[in-house]
């Protein structure tokens, strides 16, 4: 059952796995929520009837029973973690917090001209926990606008103490504000030679990657796969740390990988959510229930229904035996990893799904595609939707993309002459126009936000938020898709396609089917010579044939220019503008989209 | 409401600078998107789009008359202003102030008219 | 600059009939969304008063017997019924890119 409220005054006895500082009870929450084992918390708020050293202590707890027993005890917070909650969940606190120093390891001091731009150092810093910043009003001159940055072995505070004229706060890496580089890459016959700070055992270097990204204080990894020789050593997980934030040497080393921690990509790419297969595996832990299971997805659908359960393995049923029916072993351990792994006994293991809900819905995988053709299939773009005006009667305006549960993310410059969100419709999940009609269920629009630096098209800030009147419920044909990640800059796309409902000619009509072309990104040089007369800025993306044919034209506007990379679709581009369209060496452009996350998560994440 | 009024010198000799002030209500210069054209129209003719200041100061004039055109505003007054240097018996016309935001021109002034006389 | 070309340049139509006034780009006002052209009623002594915007869209406080058409480089306005109060001048103008301009003019009158 999901309770999302906090308990006042009550405090949840016994039960007690570890305690962290944190500087709020919501957060406390949030730790426990991350924590592969807490499903309940305590939080002592400061008070004149606590002891100061017990102030902002965060005791997590776990329980068979999901419960237990509740004594009044007055600047006490209890309350559950989200984990058996279905909604998305995110570790993102931008809170600043008032007269509070959290405490730390002080690797980094620095002055800052206010909190906002510490808060910004710690984020851009890869060690960066949290910070805490003196302000100008601080009594020590010294230390006046000093930014300290901090991390420790936990990722929260060792301890958090009242102190006037300072605020703290922690890195938004986990709102995806870093701009430190996403290296996805794993590394073939690799061993990163530094110190370990942690180890797990991993089926394969993928999950050892999406461990070392929420263990906060692992910068890369070392896996040792299951052929590796040391048998001790098989599927070891290493998680590493270094000073530079780098690995310090690189040996070649046959049957082991190594990669980097994705705390930078993480709102682009699954980091929590282990969702395959292993094959003639078994995971060891300790044993929480056995049951009888048809089929291994079935055992996984188990697992994520038990909210201790964090991995299984499911024995097939030998012929005829037990209705058909496998044994479907659930399992947890104190970190949520195997505390080992063995193979050739025939299991068939995986992991609890339930973490998936702390993945960005857009990392989802959606169905394949239909290569070749130019008119979609349903569920194949599932982020499109179609924009409609009813003035002067309705029709298709523009296309979006779904960016969140209540966000359309488009062009300004479809809202030319709007004055107000009452005329427009967003229909989802549509692949054909024809499918609207009077009675088809819409979303109303509560607000355009338009780019405050906008005016037309071709010069650029050409991007619009849309907020729904009501939240849109993910399903196979309406999902979101993932902003690229800043740290994403430096990337190649090579798989782009542009998809709407516009003109396939200059003199045409709306399609009634949702068309799709791949085209290829130019270089915005390039791009530039066929535009001399406007100025392509890099907050402007570019893509065509040199000999034109597949384009963007009227009615695709707002639209997607969506990028398939490591298996995760992403919103590279928004349909902008062009001369014609598909003319030879005239590339459509679009607005380039990581230049205006900052801007999308400001809008999005507004309180 | 929104209003806008052109005031003017009404009559000037050739090769002197016009100066016009657009005094407006109902809207602010400060909100992003929101700008204000200036327009012309000699009698009986058509009319011809002269220069435009956006609420961020950015500022785009007919390329046929720019050298002779200065485009400016006082957002703490409500008020925009023109200046025509040098001008010409062919400078005589209504001349509007149109509020444009990102949209269309929506609303105007009733103009002011101006000759230019030896 | 993109020139816009309007016809006729004037035009008598009978009350209640359809009054049809053309103008022509000299380049496509499309852009992948909106056909940035925009019309225009001028009485005399009066600044003009917007009419349709986006190719079709109607002003505020505009009667539904005015309509806007086209895309690209062709547009036109209609009119009907036709009423005493039509009778003016009228002028197309595009917002696609600086300098925004005007047509010449059609000047409607009751027949």
């Known amino acids: 059952e999901c309770v999302t409220q906090l308990l006042k005054d009550t405090c949840f006895e016994g039960g007690d796995i570890t305690t962290v500082f944190t500087p709020s009870a919501k957060y406390c929450q949030v730790v426990c929520t991350y924590h592969p084992r807490c499903l309940l918390f305590t939080f002592t708020a400061e008070s004149p009837s606590e002891d100061p050293t017990r102030w902002f202590t965060c005791v997590l707890k776990d329980s068979v029973t999901e419960t237990l027993p509740r004594v009044n005890r007055t600047a006490a917070i209890s309350g559950y973690s989200f984990k058996q909650c279905s909604h998305q969940i995110s570790a993102c606190n931008k809170d600043i917090y008032v007269d509070l120093d959290m405490k730390g390891i002080n690797y980094n001091s620095s002055v800052a001209k206010s909190a906002q731009e510490c808060q910004e150092r710690c984020t851009d810093d890869v060690h960066c926990h949290f910070f805490t910043y003196a302000t100008r009003q601080f009594p020590s001159l010294e230390h006046r606008n000093i930014c300290l940055l901090k991390h420790t072995q936990t990722g929260t505070p060792t301890r958090i103490t009242k102190l006037d004229k300072v605020v703290s706060g922690f890195s938004l890496k986990s709102c995806a504000l870093s701009n430190l580089a996403c290296i996805r890459d794993i590394f073939p016959n690799t061993v990163f030679a530094d110190s370990n700070i942690d180890s797990v055992m991993a089926p394969d270097a993928f999950v050892c990657g999406r461990i070392c990204t929420h263990h906060p204080g692992c910068l890369f990894f070392t896996f040792f796969s299951q052929e590796w020789p040391k048998e001790s050593q098989r599927n070891l997980c290493l998680l590493k740390t270094s000073e530079s934030g780098l690995p310090s040497t690189r040996i070649k080393k046959s049957k082991a990988l190594s990669g980097f921690s994705l705390q930078s990509c993480r709102h682009s790419i699954p980091v929590f959510c282990h969702s395959s297969f292993y094959h003639d595996t078994d995971f060891l832990g300790e044993e929480l229930d056995i049951v009888a299971a048809k089929s291994h997805e079935a055992c996984q659908k188990l697992c994520t229904n038990a909210v201790r359960c964090q991995f299984f393995t499911y024995t097939p049923a030998q012929a005829s035996c037990n209705e058909g029916k496998g044994k479907c072993y659930l399992k947890l351990s104190s970190n949520g990893s195997p505390t080992k792994i063995l193979h050739g006994r025939g299991g068939i293991s995986g992991y609890t799904l339930r973490l998936c809900k702390m993945d960005n819905e857009c990392t989802t995988k959606i169905k394949p595609r239909i290569v070749g053709g130019t008119a979609s299939v349903r569920g194949e773009w599932p982020w499109q939707v179609t924009l409609h005006t009813t003035s002067p009667t309705q029709r298709h305006l523009c296309g979006g993309s779904i960016i969140g549960n209540q966000w359309i993310l488009t062009a300004a410059h479809c809202f030319y002459g709007v004055e107000s969100p009452k005329i427009l419709r967003v229909y989802s999940g549509i692949l054909n126009q024809s499918e609207i009609k009077e009675d088809t269920s819409f979303f109303g629009v509560q607000e355009i936000i338009i780019h405050d630096q906008y005016k037309m098209a071709e010069s650029g800030y050409d991007i619009a938020l849309l907020k729904l009147e009501t939240t849109v419920n993910y399903t196979d044909s309406q999902r979101p898709i993932c902003l690229p990640s800043k740290g994403d800059r430096n990337v190649i796309y090579t798989d782009c396609w542009v998809t709407g409902w516009g003109y396939r000619k200059l003199r045409d009509k709306i399609q009634n089917t949702l068309q799709k072309a791949k085209i290829p990104l130019v270089t915005n040089e390039e791009c530039q010579k066929r535009y001399r007369g406007h100025k392509i800025t890099h907050k402007m993306i570019c893509a065509g044939y040199r000999e034109g044919g597949k384009d963007a034209c009227k009615g695709d506007s707002g639209g997607p220019l969506s990028c398939k990379h490591n298996e995760v679709w992403h919103l590279v581009g928004i349909t902008s503008w062009g001369e014609g369209c598909a003319q030879r060496e005239r590339p459509g452009v679009y607005t380039n989209v990581v230049e205006y996350v900052d801007w999308i998560l400001e809008k999005t994440q507004a309180v | 409401q929104v209003t806008l009024k052109e005031s003017g010198p009404g009559i000037l000799q050739p090769s002197q600078t016009l100066s016009l002030t657009c005094s407006f209500s109902?809207?602010?210069?400060?909100?992003?998107?929101?700008?204000v054209s200036w327009i012309r129209q000699p009698s009986g003719k058509g009319l011809e789009w002269l220069a435009h200041?956006?609420?961020?100061?950015?500022?785009r004039f007919n390329p046929s008359l720019k050298s002779r055109l200065t485009i400016s505003k006082d957002t703490s007054r409500d008020q925009v202003f023109l200046m025509i240097t040098s001008v010409d018996t062919a400078d005589s016309a209504t001349y509007f102030c149109?509020?444009?935001?990102?949209?269309?021109?929506?609303?105007w002034g009733q103009g002011t008219l101006v000759t230019v006389s030896s | 600059d993109i020139v816009l070309t309007q016809s006729p340049a004037s035009l008598a139509v009978s009350l209640g009939q359809r009054a049809t006034i053309s103008c022509r780009a000299s380049?496509?006002?499309?852009?992948?969304?909106?056909?940035?052209m925009n019309w225009f009623q001028q009485k005399p002594g009066q600044p003009p008063k917007l009419l349709i915007y986006?190719?079709?869209n109607l002003g505020s406080g505009v009667p539904a017997r005015f309509s806007g058409s086209g895309s690209g480089t062709d547009f036109s306005l209609n009119i009907h019924p036709m009423e005493e109060d039509d009778t003016a001048m009228y002028f197309c103008?595009?917002?696609?890119?600086?300098?925004?301009?005007f047509g010449g003019g059609t000047e409607l009158e009751i027949k």
């Open positions: 380049e496509s006002v499309d852009n992948y969304a909106i056909s940035f």
């Open positions: 200041i956006y609420w961020d100061d950015d500022k």
């Open positions: 986006a190719a079709s």
């Open positions: 109902g809207f602010s210069l400060n909100t992003p998107g929101m700008g």
């Open positions: 103008q595009q917002d696609k890119e600086v300098p925004w301009t």
């Open positions: 149109a509020r444009k935001g990102r949209g269309p021109f929506t609303y």
